[in-house]
Structures are given as structure tokens and as C-alpha cells.
Amino acid sequence: MASMGLQVMGIALAVLGWLAVMLCCALPMWRVTAFIGSNIVTSQTIWEGLWMNCVVQSTGQMQCKVYDSLLALPQDLQAARALVIISIIVAALGVLLSVVGGKCTNCLEDESAKAKTMIVAGVVFLLAGLMVIVPVSWTAHNIIQDFYNPLVASGQKREMGASLYVGWAASGLLLLGGGLLCCNCPPRTDKPYSAKYSAARSAAASNYV
């Protein structure tokens, strides 16, 4: 029973991580640059995302524009976009496998096959988690590097956007969920149990006759 609870917990965490990756991908806040004007009215913030840029004025007015093409997307964000999309697809495969191999589903009859499927799902979630943590950490590294670079103008110094924190949370959930599913070992005493059970059944049948 404890094993089933662990499995449900693992799947739940991984699914939450998968949803968080989607959020991280969609949010246009990977890099944030604030431009402070001579007065508060002229202050603006530029958000850079994987799909669009947004200009947020101090009045609260926000205008976003989807990149005209890949031409407009900086190389690091291009790579991040690719990895995050692959991570979403990989995590979706993990969700599918975890449903197939779940203890409370009947897609597979064999308990050993179910357990193995669940381990594969765990590994897939771990891979998805790594695919998110790489671009998120790389983008953060670049921002931090620029922040402490004396050659970079003060106005040019960016901050880490909300998408990066969501990305870290997503990778954490995927890694944790995947790890829990990998701990789900296949039953070692599977064969002896079924043998004993059939023997007992035949004995009872002969006595009855």
C-alpha cells in the first residue's frame, strides 16, 4: 500500500512539474530589463520570453509582440525554446507511461511489466527535468554574469524573470516525481506466489470431488 502511495505521489509531482514546464515556456518573463526614467512615469520594463517580447509601462499598460520569426530570437533563447519544447514532449510521454504502468489502471495485467513501465516513466521524467534545468540555469548564469560584469552598462543589466523560477520549480518537481517512480521496484516474489496459489487451488478442488 505504501508503494502505491509513493507511486501516486510521484505521478502527481511529475504531472505538476509538466504543467509548470508549460507555464515556464509560455510566460514571457525569461529576462527582465527595467529602464528607470528621470521620473516614475517614464519608467519601463522589457520582458523577453521564448515566444514574445513585452513592454510594460509604469502606468501598467502592457504590449506584447510575438517574435516575427526565429530571426528575432537570441541564440540562447532559441536553444532554450528547443529544449523546453522537447522537455514538454518527453514529460508527456512520461505521463502516458505512468498511466499505463499505474497500479490503479488495467492497461497492463502483469504486475512486473507495470512496475518496469513505471520505472521507465520515472527515468523519462528525470530526463524531462534535466532538459528544463539546463536552459533555465544557463539563462540565469548569463544574466548573473552580465550583472557583475563592469563592462556592461548599468542600464543594460538584466534581472531574472519569473519564468526562470517557475522553470526551476518545474525541474525540481519532475526530478522528485521521477525519482519516486524509479524507487518503485518490481516485485521479486512474483512467480512463487502465483505457483503457490495455483497449487492450493487444485488441492482444494480434488478434496471437494
Partner: antibody
Framework: QVQLKESGPGLVQPSQTLSLTCTVS????????VIWVRQPPGKGLEWVGV???????EYSSPLKSRLTISRDTSKSQVFLKMNNLQTEDTAMYFC???????????????WGQGTLVTVSS | DTVLTQSPALAVSPGERVTISCRAT??????MHWYQQKPGQQPKLLIY???HLDSGVPARFSGSGSGTDFTLTIDPVDADDTATYYC?????????FGAGTKLELK
């Protein structure tokens, strides 16, 4: 110190191809976009095209069919090639560096001195 | 392409306040920038993001606007400000410049 310098032939025959070079220093072409802008004598600035830091290019709609912008990052050079030149292509050609990497940061604090191209037979 | 329309020429006396306008055919958010060009020189960035002064630009220059209507204000005008002023947008690809406003001093 950021510097850009344009170089070219000065005089080009009509229907010939123009080749200009923008040599940069003080920054990497892998980090910033470089645009080409031209200015016919006594007229205003005309945006020609851009070479993005990721190696992709974008051209002005009227010039798109005759224009090619390329680069050599090892030599820190951006090239402009324009074919089938006409007398109306006579202009001062400038290259300039963008403020930052992303398309949205499309303002240009650093400019070259420009090179005058005259199209005449 | 986004077309930027500027007032063609202005003549003012030193010490006065002058406003140069730039209108876009479609919204450019606040991604409008202003350049000053003196005869025989390359353009010089004055203002970026509609209202932010580039480093080393005197405080008498200021910019405002959002969407389609933008203004560059010089107050007070100095004799050294005789030049052509261009607006440029970077919201819509391809980027475009205005035709320029020639500022002359009386």
C-alpha cells in the same frame, strides 16, 4: 571601446554590384546586431538591413531582391552586397550596432563614420 | 512596413522651446527612438524607448509618447542644436526611420 568602420569602392558603375564592409571592434558580432543604413545626398536616413547576432538577416522591403548581408565573425566584419546598382543608390552608407541582443532592443548608440558610394558611368 | 511621418522643418530662436512630432501608421508601443544628425556627420542617438536619454545627452532634450504619437522636446534650444532629427521604430519589423525634421535657428 566600441568602433565601426565602413569601407567600399567609392565609385560603382550602373548595373554593377556594390560590396561594402563594416569592420567592428570592442564587441562581438555574436552578441549584437549590426544594421546598414543609407542616406542619399540631401535626403533622410533609410534602413537597409540587419545582421542579427544569431547570424540571421532581415532586409528592407524595397531592397530585399537585390541585397545580401553576411558576416565573418573571426574577422569581426559584416558585409553588404547589393546588385544591379542604379544612380538612385548613390548615398552615404552607414553601419551601426544595436543596444543589445534581442530584436526589441533596436536602437543604435554606435555608428560608423559612413562611406560614400557614387553610382555613375 | 510602418511609416513614420515627421514635421518637415522648424525655425526657432535660441532659448525657445521646440517640439518635434513623429506619427506612426501603426502602434510601436514605446519602441521609438530619436537621433540627431549634423551636416557631414553620422547620426547620434539622443533618446531611446520614447523617453530615455542616452548617456551624455543634455537634459534639455526630452521625449514622450506611446502607441502612434511621439514628441521630441528641446527646452531651451541652443545654437548647437541646429541639425536634422530623425525618429526610428523597432517594434515592427523591418525597422523604419522618419523622413527627418530640419531644425534651424532664427
Amino acid at each position: 571601446q566600441v568602433q565601426l568602420k565602413e569601407s567600399g569602392p567609392g565609385l560603382v558603375q550602373p548595373s554593377q554590384t556594390l560590396s561594402l564592409t563594416c569592420t567592428v571592434s570592442g564587441f562581438s558580432l555574436r552578441s549584437y546586431g549590426v544594421i546598414w543604413v543609407r542616406q542619399p545626398p540631401g535626403k533622410g536616413l533609410e534602413w537597409v538591413g540587419v545582421m542579427w547576432n544569431n547570424g540571421n538577416t532581415e532586409y528592407s522591403s524595397p531592397l530585399k531582391s537585390r541585397l545580401t548581408i553576411s558576416r565573418d565573425t573571426s574577422k569581426s566584419q559584416v558585409f553588404l552586397k547589393m546588385n544591379n546598382l542604379q544612380t538612385e543608390d548613390t548615398a552615404m552608407y552607414f553601419c551601426a550596432r544595436s543596444w543589445d541582443t534581442n530584436h526589441i532592443y533596436g536602437w543604435f548608440p554606435y555608428w560608423g563614420q559612413g562611406t560614400l558610394v557614387t553610382v555613375s558611368s | 512596413d510602418t511609416v513614420l511621418t515627421q514635421s518637415p522643418a522648424l525655425a526657432v530662436s535660441p532659448g525657445e522651446r521646440v517640439t518635434i512630432s513623429c506619427r506612426a501608421t501603426e502602434s510601436v508601443s514605446t519602441l521609438m527612438h530619436w537621433y540627431q544628425q549634423k551636416p557631414g556627420q553620422q547620426p547620434k542617438l539622443l533618446i531611446y524607448l520614447a523617453s530615455h536619454l542616452d548617456s551624455g545627452v543634455p537634459a534639455r532634450f526630452s521625449g514622450s509618447g506611446s502607441g502612434t504619437d511621439f514628441t521630441l522636446t528641446i527646452d531651451p534650444v541652443d545654437a548647437d542644436d541646429t541639425a536634422t532629427y530623425y525618429c526610428q521604430q523597432s517594434w515592427n519589423a523591418p525597422y523604419t526611420f522618419g523622413a527627418g525634421t530640419k531644425l534651424e535657428l532664427k
